[in-house]
């Protein structure tokens, strides 16, 4: 049903869904703090632009009685229940900042006539791609896939002279929400990644993964997995690893690798870590001081969602345009706005673009070093360390298939 929006006459409201089921186990209080910090910034920016308007947020909490798994498994109905609550209260803001779970976002998008923009900190799955009024402020699976295909095909770098066309993917079902959808996308037979690879097998058991590490008959030297170093160690332990194995560890939302005093443990020497370029000022900000390196990105996405709304509101008000129109709902894409930690770019489909960073462990210093960066906006790789101190032979990444000559 049509719900009137609190979105006119100089008063603009943001509906923030505070769902018990969330992509990251973050206390809702921290997300509230992030939203409130964002509101302060937006109010200041609008005032500086000479726009004398009111911007507020309404936090919509679910009762948590039915949907209490805490993760995303029971989020589908929770999102719809919250929308029903908004509908019954006849109280909808100009924008919905909310569901981080792929299940809930997909279902909410499907089951509602969205004439308002939806901003998500999460919704990583491919099923949330190409949604006309959905904006995602954390790297979705599609971006990861495009990097991997780009990197697999690269063969003209001093440290990577072979194109790759094969991979194992380790996916055991215990992953975090982001990892679950990243690996899901790699597993999907119809995905771009699967389409571009000649061979891909999903390893679902710990033993399968462990056996591959020294299996002379393995079909690929490359294994993709998702998580942090500790996750890898629990799986791999102190087992020997064949010298031409390359483990790609996807750990996008973790700034820790860039801290000065971090030392890479021995078991990381065969590993390339894919993460995001860290923010500049986040460590000292009031809302993020007590957050873990992963949760910083989640809270930041909420904060940036508020700043994005403020950016769009400012543009529409300055142009004398109506906010409660399909044009506004469809406008949250193909733009760059000033985020909390610098410019944030959204692609044509409203998904955040970022700089991904591939790290390796220096055998000399035991430090994580940047091997290359990848700009998701232009789908381009930029080598950084032209003579890396790799563990691999001749300081070059091996071929993906043992015994195969130059391609």
């Amino acid at each position: 049903s049509q719900v009137s929006q609190n979105c006119h006459n100089g008063s603009y409201e943001i509906s923030v869904l505070m769902m018990g089921n969330s992509a990251f186990a973050e206390p809702l209080k921290n997300l509230e703090d992030a939203v409130n910090e964002g509101l302060e910034i937006v109010r200041g920016r609008l005032q500086n632009a000479g726009l004398n308007v009111t911007v507020n947020a309404t936090f919509m909490y679910s009762d948590g009685l039915i949907h209490n798994s805490g993760d995303c498994r029971s989020s589908t109905c929770e999102g719809l229940d919250l929308l029903r609550k908004i509908s019954n209260a006849q109280r909808m803001g100009c924008v919905l900042i909310g569901p981080s779970c792929t299940y809930s976002t997909f279902q909410m998008y499907l089951d509602t006539e969205l004439s308002y923009p939806m901003i998500s900190a999460g919704s990583f799955g491919l099923s949330c791609d190409y949604k006309e009024t959905l904006t995602r402020l954390m790297s979705p699976a599609r971006k990861l896939m495009y990097f991997l295909v780009n990197f697999w095909k690269t063969n003209d770098l001093p440290f990577k002279t072979y194109s790759w066309s094969t991979s194992y993917v380790y996916k055991n079902g215990t992953e975090t929400e982001d990892c679950f959808w990243y690996l899901n996308a790699l597993e999907a037979s119809v995905s771009y990644f699967s389409h571009e690879l000649g061979f891909k097998v999903v390893l679902r058991q710990d033993k399968e993964f462990q056996d591959i590490l020294m299996d002379h008959n393995r079909k690929s030297n490359v294994i993709i997995m998702c998580g942090g170093p500790e996750f890898l160690y629990k799986l791999k332990g102190d087992r020997a690893v064949a010298e031409d194995i390359v483990i790609i560890l996807v750990d996008l939302f973790n700034d820790q690798y860039f801290e000065d005093n971090v030392t890479a443990p021995d078991y990381m020497k065969n590993v390339l870590v894919l993460t995001l370029s860290p923010g500049n000022s986040l460590l000292n900000s009031s809302f993020s001081r007590n957050l873990s390196p992963t949760k910083r990105d989640f809270a930041l996405a909420y904060l940036n969602g508020i700043l994005l709304f403020g950016h769009m509101l400012k543009i529409f008000l300055e142009n004398g345009e109506n906010i409660t129109t399909p044009k506004f709902a469809h406008a949250f894409r193909n733009l760059t706005f000033e985020g909390y930690d610098g410019p944030v770019t959204l692609d044509d489909w409203g998904d955040v673009d970022s700089t991904m960073v591939l790290l390796y462990t220096s055998v000399d210093t035991k430090k994580y070093k940047v091997l290359l960066t990848y700009d998701t906006h232009v789908n381009k790789t930029y080598p950084v360390d032209m003579s890396p101190t790799f563990t691999w032979k001749n300081s070059k990444l091996p071929n993906d298939i043992t015994g195969r000559g130059p391609q």
Partner: nanobody
Amino acid sequence: QVQLVESGGDLVQPGGSLRLSCAASGSIGSIYAMGWYRQAPGRQRELVATTTSGGTTNYADSVKGRFTIAGDNAKNTVFLQMNSLRPEDTAVYYCKIQTHWYVYWGQGTQVTVSS
């Protein structure tokens, strides 16, 4: 602030035994490996023994069969049982704890083997 405190160093006669202990205070996180290193005057610091949380132990050739390392991850402590001590074992012994992210060193405890 994490601190490692070693104890157990002493003056002992050749053939004697000592047990070194190292305890971490503060929030250290999940431990990957613990170890003992030593540095004799005018020499480089060298590995004595290490143990990982996965159960792998590693000893310097010169101490194999005489020294035993044991770690207690739950209590953030590591021990080094040293038997059949020799004069060449004289050194400052340092404990090292490595989490999955950080490396911590103790201040060292002096072991002197002399008659």
